[in-house]
């Protein structure tokens, strides 16, 4: 049904949608104080602009009583139930705020009438991909395939001097929301990674990854997993690996690489890492100082929710336009705006850019060094460390296939 | 539009140190690595080295270690090579070339002339 | 290190004539690029990747080869042509010139 929009005469609201289920486990209370923070933030950005308007946000509960698994796999539901809150209520903002979960995105987006922006500090998956008033502020999976593909093909840098075209993925069911989507979109036969790769094998067993690191007749040299260093540690251990295998850790959001302190284990030495860029420090915030490293993007992507709600509603109201119109709802995308930490990208879908940084251990110091950066707007690389100090022979990464001819 | 300006000429004395600096203007700096190559009088080109500016990560020539000092000044958008104990072998023309890769070396300095004379 | 040899070391053609300059690897590489350097100025990217011409590079010049053997070819000299051309690698570290070709107009 048609639900009339608190959006108007100088008063305007958001809706934040605080789901039990939930990307990443992290308790509602902090995602209070990021919005609650990022609506200060909004407050003054508009008041400075000379623009006297109210903006508050409405925290939507579900009972969760029959929603409660706490993690994405029961949240379809969970988020049409909240939008039928709404509806009874007769109460929806300006813009929604959440859900994070790929299902309920993808759900909601296709059971209601979307004449307002939808901004998920989540949704993944392929799957809300090309959504026309979905906005997504953490990095889809659309993004890593890219670099992926864009990594494979790569034969013209002094340390990555073979094309690849293959590649086992390891994913055992067990993954957190967002690496499970990841994985999903490289597992997927219809998805951009398959189309380019000459080969690619799924391993859902321990066994199987733990088989392959040794075992001669193996397909490719490359293998893909997704999360932390200690992940990695608990399938891998201790095992000996053979000298051309390279395994590309995914590990997008988590930024203790960068510590000053931090010392790589020797088990990472025949890994590369993906994982974002870090942001200025956030830690003297007073919605971050509770959260961990990992959680701190996801907070931060509700915090720039509503920063980005803040500029989309003062270029509007500057231009003397209505809030309440399909321009309104399709206009989260192709811009930039001031984020809590910085400039902020949204691409042609509405999809935050970012700078990925793939890392590796070098030997010598056994720190965890920049190899290259990529940015996802252009889909450009930026090496930076063109004579690392590799395990791999000669400081250049193995072809993916043992056996190949020098290169 | 992308430029690179290298410092003047310079003249000093064997044993002596120099420091020549190549100022960037028309693109983020800190997103391109920075080469230095010198060209002895009429002869070929030889890489130094190269400097990342954001991260300062930095590849020599196994020929220049212990020669040639990188160093950026990210608030300036300049790199510098310092080049100590002078000696003649060490007068040529010094360039600063950016990489945007995969095009690499795409930009050059107009070139630092130095010559290593008592 | 690999090392680029360039041939001829000097040459000169007349105007529309065909030339060829070689750059031999004594190592297989991926990719050799090119630039072209005249007399009091700097070096300018001339081709990339082999084969792809660098912005304001006329069409008459081509690059081409794979493995050790690599050429530049100008298909019909002009007195503008008239320059020295270095080969270049960055398939190993460190990267590395050849020694130069430098050519004349007739």
């Known amino acids: 049904s048609q639900v009339s929009q608190n959006c108007h005469n100088g008063s305007y609201e958001i809706s934040v949608l605080m789901m039990g289920n939930s990307a990443f486990a992290e308790p509602l209370k902090n995602l209070e104080d990021a919005v609650n923070e990022g609506l200060e933030i909004v407050r003054g950005r508009l008041q400075n602009a000379g623009l006297n308007v109210t903006v508050n946000a409405t925290f939507m509960y579900s009972d969760g009583l029959i929603h409660n698994s706490g993690d994405c796999r029961s949240s379809t539901c969970e988020g049409l139930d909240l939008l039928r809150k709404i509806s009874n209520a007769q109460r929806m903002g300006c813009v929604l705020i959440g859900p994070s979960c790929t299902y309920s995105t993808f759900q909601m987006y296709l059971d209601t009438e979307l004449s307002y922006p939808m901004i998920s500090a989540g949704s993944f998956g392929l799957s809300c991909d090309y959504k026309e008033t979905l906005t997504r502020l953490m990095s889809p999976a659309r993004k890593l395939m890219y670099f992926l593909v864009n990594f494979w093909k790569t034969n013209d840098l002094p340390f990555k001097t073979y094309s690849w075209s293959t590649s086992y993925v390891y994913k055992n069911g067990t993954e957190t929301e967002d690496c499970f989507w990841y994985l999903n979109a490289l597992e997927a036969s219809v998805s951009y990674f398959s189309h380019e790769l000459g080969f690619k094998v799924v391993l859902r067993q321990d066994k199987e990854f733990q088989d392959i690191l040794m075992d001669h007749n193996r397909k490719s040299n490359v293998i893909i997993m997704c999360g932390g260093p200690e992940f990695l540690y608990k399938l891998k251990g201790d095992r000996a690996v053979a000298e051309d295998i390279v395994i590309i850790l995914v590990d997008l959001f988590n930024d203790q690489y960068f510590e000053d302190n931090v010392t790589a284990p020797d088990y990472m030495k025949n890994v590369l890492v993906l994982t974002l860029s870090p942001g200025n420090s956030l830690l003297n915030s007073s919605f971050s100082r509770n959260l961990s490293p990992t959680k701190r993007d996801f907070a931060l992507a509700y915090l720039n929710g509503i920063l980005l709600f803040g500029h989309m509603l003062k270029i509007f109201l500057e231009n003397g336009e209505n809030i309440t119109t399909p321009k309104f709802a399709h206009a989260f995308r192709n811009l930039t705006f001031e984020g809590y930490d910085g400039p902020v990208t949204l691409d042609d879908w509405g999809d935050v850019d970012s700078t990925m940084v793939l890392l590796y251990t070098s030997v010598d110091t056994k720190k965890y060094k920049v190899l290259l950066t990529y940015d996802t707007h252009v889909n450009k690389t930026y090496p930076v460390d063109m004579s690392p100090t590799f395990t791999w022979k000669n400081s250049k990464l193995p072809n993916d296939i043992t056996g190949r001819g020098p290169q | 539009e992308f430029q690179l300006q290298q410092s003047g000429p310079e003249l000093v004395k064997p044993g002596a140190s120099v420091k020549i600096s190549c100022k960037a203007s028309g693109y983020s700096f800190t997103d391109h690595n920075m080469n230095w190559v010198k060209q002895s009088n009429g002869k070929s080109l030889e890489w130094i080295g190269v400097i990342n500016p954001k991260y300062g990560t930095i590849s020599n020539n196994q020929k220049f270690k212990g020669k040639a000092t990188l160093t950026v000044d990210q608030s300036s958008s300049t790199a510098y090579m310092q080049l100590n104990s002078l000696t003649a072998e060490d007068s040529a023309v010094y360039y600063c070339a950016r990489d945007d890769y995969p095009n690499y070396f795409d930009y050059w300095g107009q070139g630092t002339t130095l010559t290593v004379s008592s | 290190q690999i090392v680029l040899t360039q041939s001829p070391a000097i040459m000169s053609a007349s105007p529309g004539e065909k030339v060829t300059i070689s750059c031999s690897a004594n190592?297989?590489?991926?990719?050799i690029y090119w630039y072209q350097q005249k007399p009091g100025s700097s070096p300018k990217p001339w081709i990339y990747?082999?084969?792809n011409l660098a912005s304001g590079v006329p069409a008459r010049f081509s690059g081409s080869g794979s493995g050790t053997s690599y050429s530049l070819t100008i298909s019909s000299m002009e007195a503008e042509d008239a320059a020295t051309y270095y080969c270049q690698q960055y398939h190993s570290f460190p990267p590395t010139f050849g020694g130069g070709t430098k050519l004349e107009i007739k």
């Open positions: 190592s297989s590489v991926n990719y």
């Open positions: 990747r082999t084969s």
